[in-house]
C-alpha cells in the first residue's frame, strides 16, 4: 500500500521551501498540542483536492482568537491567489460537515506531505 501515495491535482502551488515550512509548522502544532487545539473549535471539512490551499484557508480563517494556528493562517494566505475573509464558503467544502481543528490540521499535514513527496511544489 505504500505505493499508493496521494496524487496532487493542478492549481496554484507554493515553492518547495514554503511548502516545507508549512509542513514544519503543522508538525509543531500537532506535536506540541496539550489542551484541545483552539478549544475544540470546529471547521468546515473539504471534499476535493483542487484549490486546496484557498479552501483550507477559508476553513481555518473562521477560527478566531487561536494563536496556535495564526502562523498557519498567514502561511496559507500566501499560497492562495485571492483574498480570503471569514464567512466565505467554497464549493470545495462539505456542507453541514464540520470536523475538529486538531483533526483538520492533522489531515492537512498528511495531504501536504503527499504533495511534497510527489514534488508538487513548482
Amino acid at each position: 500500500l505504500t505505493c499508493l501515495g496521494g496524487f496532487a491535482s493542478p492549481g496554484p502551488v507554493p515553492p518547495s521551501t514554503a511548502l516545507r515550512e508549512l509542513i514544519e509548522e503543522l508538525v509543531n502544532i500537532t506535536q506540541n498540542q496539550k489542551a484541545p487545539l483552539c478549544n475544540g473549535s470546529m471547521v468546515w471539512s473539504i471534499n476535493l483536492t483542487a484549490g486546496m490551499y484557498c479552501a483550507a484557508l477559508e476553513s481555518l480563517i473562521n477560527v478566531s482568537g487561536c494563536s496556535a494556528i495564526e502562523k498557519t493562517q498567514r502561511m496559507l494566505s500566501g499560497f492562495c491567489p485571492h483574498k480570503v475573509s471569514a464567512g466565505q464558503f467554497s464549493s470545495l467544502h462539505v456542507r453541514d460537515t464540520k470536523i475538529e481543528v486538531a483533526q483538520f490540521v492533522k489531515d492537512l499535514l498528511l495531504h501536504l506531505k503527499k504533495l511534497f513527496r510527489e514534488g508538487q511544489f513548482n
Partner: nanobody, 118 residues
C-alpha cells in the same frame, strides 16, 4: 471524532454479488488513501483492495482481482467495494480503513460480515 461505518454485508449465495459502503466522518476523507481489509474466521487480517485519495490508482489482492472493484465518492465521503462472483472463501468480516503509510493516520471501522453460502 473519526468514524468509519461499514454497511452492505449479509448472506449471499456463491456466484452472487454485494456492494459494501463505508461512510466516513470526522476527518478529511478526500485527502486519505483508503482501503478494505478482511478477516476470515480463524484467519489473519488480509488487505483486499485500496484506492488513492483521488481515486486514480487502485490495488487488489490476487485472490479478488477481476471480481472486486473499489471506488470512492469524495463528495459523499464514502468508500465502496463492489464484490461479484463471490465464493465461499470470501466469507469474512470486511473492514474499511485508511491506507496511509504513516500509522499516525490509521483509522478503522467496526466491520461488516459477509457470508457466502448456499
Amino acid at each position: 471524532g473519526v468514524q468509519l461505518l461499514e454497511s452492505g454485508g449479509g448472506l449471499v449465495q456463491p456466484g452472487g454479488s454485494l456492494r459494501l459502503s463505508c461512510a466516513a466522518s470526522g476527518f478529511t476523507f478526500a485527502w486519505y488513501d483508503m482501503g478494505w481489509a478482511r478477516q476470515a474466521p480463524g484467519k489473519g487480517l488480509e488487505w483486499v483492495s485500496a484506492i488513492d485519495d483521488l481515486g486514480r490508482r487502485t490495488y487488489y489482492a490476487d485472490s479478488v482481482k477481476g471480481r472486486f472493484t473499489i471506488s470512492r465518492d469524495n463528495s459523499k465521503n464514502t468508500l465502496y467495494l463492489q464484490m461479484n462472483s463471490l465464493r465461499a472463501e470470501d466469507t469474512a468480516v470486511y473492514y474499511c480503513a485508511t491506507a496511509e503509510r504513516d500509522d499516525t493516520f490509521d483509522y478503522w471501522g467496526q466491520g461488516t460480515l459477509v457470508t457466502v453460502s448456499s
